[in-house]
């Protein structure tokens, strides 16, 4: 499943954040004209992934891949041949299930976020990791940081690169 | 995507190997009448996953899941709704792309194997992990071990459990 077919710039940013790759994150954020406060907010999220080590990146990448390739994201877009299969439930827009997950990651409670992840990947190690990341983000980010992250996400979702 | 619908015994063996579960591996190998040398060969592969820890299992599971749910594997079997999606490109036979990946894992060079994985999952962390596993298998397994692993795979592919 080619996630990049839905909203490539979103996945660029996600994997740059999750892989702790500052260079790739800067490159991706420049493409969507991120402000300094928006960059700062994303780097706080990135710090959580880096602090939690490689396993964190992989497990959360696994969650993202799983949600993105789930029935909820593949929606009505299945053609009669796999050749034409696309994830674009809404043109090239990001899948609503992914959007919901990201929103809960920023604005929901740890329980709400972990429950949403559990719908897609219920391995205990995955859920523990999701909670650790969520708690880290809640501890590191101010309300203002979260608002900046949400405004950046809006830029991403409405970007021509999405 | 239900991989088990294509060749359940193959995925039983793969996940037993990748998860370092000796008991499950023994059970699965008994079902296909594996010889002692064939068991030894599979256990050497399993050792590589165990030595490389949880991260290795998760990442390689991600690769296998991705290849198994790729366009190359979904073949002509797509229905009009995702609900009915099946992988059975050739009845219940294993997908050729999965077969090719496993063959390269055993008989190809590290470059050849990683390049094939890269067609499905181009994250650096996934590809580095694939190379580490491949290097380990090349170091641990003799030519005879590899021949035994290939003969076991033939038994799996032609088994009524596939």
């Amino acid at each position: 499943v080619k996630m990049a077919e839905t909203c490539p710039i979103f996945y660029d940013v996600f994997f740059a954040v999750a892989n702790g790759n500052e260079l790739l994150l800067d490159l991706s954020l420049t493409k969507v004209n991120a402000t300094e406060p928006e960059r700062t907010a994303m780097k706080k999220i990135q710090d959580c992934y880096v602090e939690n080590g490689l396993i964190s990146r992989v497990l959360d990448g696994l969650v993202m891949t799983t949600i993105s390739s789930s029935k909820d994201c593949m929606g009505e877009a299945v053609q009669n041949t796999v050749e034409d299969l696309k994830l674009n439930t809404l043109g090239r827009e990001i899948c609503p299930a992914v959007k919901r997950g990201v929103d809960l990651f920023l604005t929901g409670t740890p329980d709400e976020y972990v429950e949403q992840v559990a719908q897609y990947k219920a391995l205990p190690v995955v859920l523990e990791n999701a909670r650790i990341l969520k708690n880290c983000v809640d501890a590191k980010m101010t309300e203002e940081d979260k608002e900046n992250a949400l405004s950046l996400l809006d830029k991403i979702y409405t970007s021509p690169l999405c | 995507v239900k991989m088990a619908e294509t060749c359940p015994i193959f995925y039983d063996v793969f996940f037993a190997v990748a998860n370092g579960n000796e008991l499950l591996l023994d059970l699965s190998l008994t079902k296909v009448n594996a010889t002692e040398p064939e068991r030894t060969a599979m256990k050497k592969i399993q050792d590589c996953y165990v030595e490389n820890g949880l991260i290795s299992r998760v990442l390689d599971g991600l690769v296998m899941t991705t290849i198994s749910s790729s366009k190359d594997c979904m073949g002509e079997a797509v229905q009009n709704t995702v609900e009915d999606l099946k992988l059975n490109t050739l009845g219940r036979e294993i997908c050729p792309a999965v077969k090719r990946g496993v063959d390269l894992f055993l008989t190809g060079t590290p470059d050849e194997y990683v390049e094939q994985v890269a067609q499905y999952k181009a994250l650096p962390v996934v590809l580095e992990n694939a190379r580490i596993l491949k290097n380990c298998v090349d170091a641990k397994m003799t030519e005879e071990d590899k021949e035994n692993a290939l003969s076991l795979l033939d038994k799996i592919y032609t088994s009524p459990l596939c």
Partner: antibody, heavy 123, light 107 residues
Framework: QVVLVESGGGVVQPGRSLRLSCAAS????????MHWVRQAPGKGLEWVAV????????YYVDSVKGRFTISRDNSNNTIYLQMNSLRAEDTAVYYC????????????????WGQGTLVTVSS | DIQMTQSPSTLSASVGDRVTITCRAS??????LAWYQQKPGKAPKLLIF???GLESGVPFRFSGSGSGTEFTLTISSLQPDDFATYYC?????????FGQGTKVEIK
């Protein structure tokens, strides 16, 4: 097997230019990021530049930015390093190296190296 | 740039010895670390990547460990072919940076 052969080194005066080439064989050239790494006489290794597998991104160490340009020709399996405004401190053996991992190319792990070509900047 | 510091700079050892080289990063590089071996007049050779992953064809006596800022390269039983200079290199960022090298010489 993977073979990388550098050429174009030599003695050059400060302020002048030189172009290094690296011919690659034995692998799918267009799938890999390629790098230049240098080593001053008796010193350690210093990464100089990278070009991604498709030429879409190029990065340089700060000390050569604006003076050196990396490029590639995927049809001829060759990468180049155009070195302008050379300085004495650019004196080094220049190695061409291939990224270990294909396509992603973002991780600068140097899996394969050429034998190197010596560049001497001296008046 | 991330600074990589190796210790010791020179190490005298005998065949059969267990040898350990340390590499410290000025900030966390997670597991994105490689080790290289270089012999005089030759190009470096990749030994280990992702902190502990052995490259193809490298003997099992070489092993790597560590994450974050502290890493080690261990040679379990030094062989005559192992006398060389060893470099660590982080690849968490561009620019990738190398340690200054550790020369392993015959005691």
């Amino acid at each position: 097997q993977v073979v990388l052969v550098e050429s174009g080194g030599g003695v050059v005066q400060p302020g002048r230019s030189l172009r290094l080439s690296c011919a690659a064989s034995g692998f799918t050239f267009s799938s890999y990021g390629m790098h230049w790494v240098r080593q001053a006489p008796g010193k350690g290794l210093e990464w100089v530049a990278v070009i991604w597998y498709d030429g879409s991104n190029k990065y340089y160490v700060d000390s050569v930015k604006g003076r050196f340009t990396i490029s590639r020709d995927n049809s001829n399996n060759t990468i180049y390093l155009q070195m302008n405004s050379l300085r004495a401190e650019d004196t080094a053996v220049y190695y061409c190296a291939r990224s270990l991992i294909p396509v992603a190319g973002t991780d600068p792990i140097f899996g394969y190296w050429g034998q190197g070509t010596l560049v001497t900047v001296s008046s | 740039d991330i600074q990589m510091t190796q210790s010791p700079s020179t190490l005298s050892a005998s065949v059969g010895d267990r040898v350990t080289i340390t590499c410290r990063a000025s900030q966390s590089v997670s597991s994105w670390l490689a080790w290289y071996q270089q012999k005089p007049g030759k190009a470096p050779k990749l030994l280990i990547f992702k902190a502990s992953g052995l490259e193809s064809g490298v003997p099992f006596r070489f092993s790597g460990s560590g994450s974050g800022t502290e890493f080690t390269l261990t040679i379990s039983s030094l062989q005559p072919d192992d006398f060389a200079t060893y470099y660590c290199q982080q690849y968490n960022t561009y620019s990738p940076t190398f340690g200054q090298g550790t020369k392993v010489e015959i005691k």
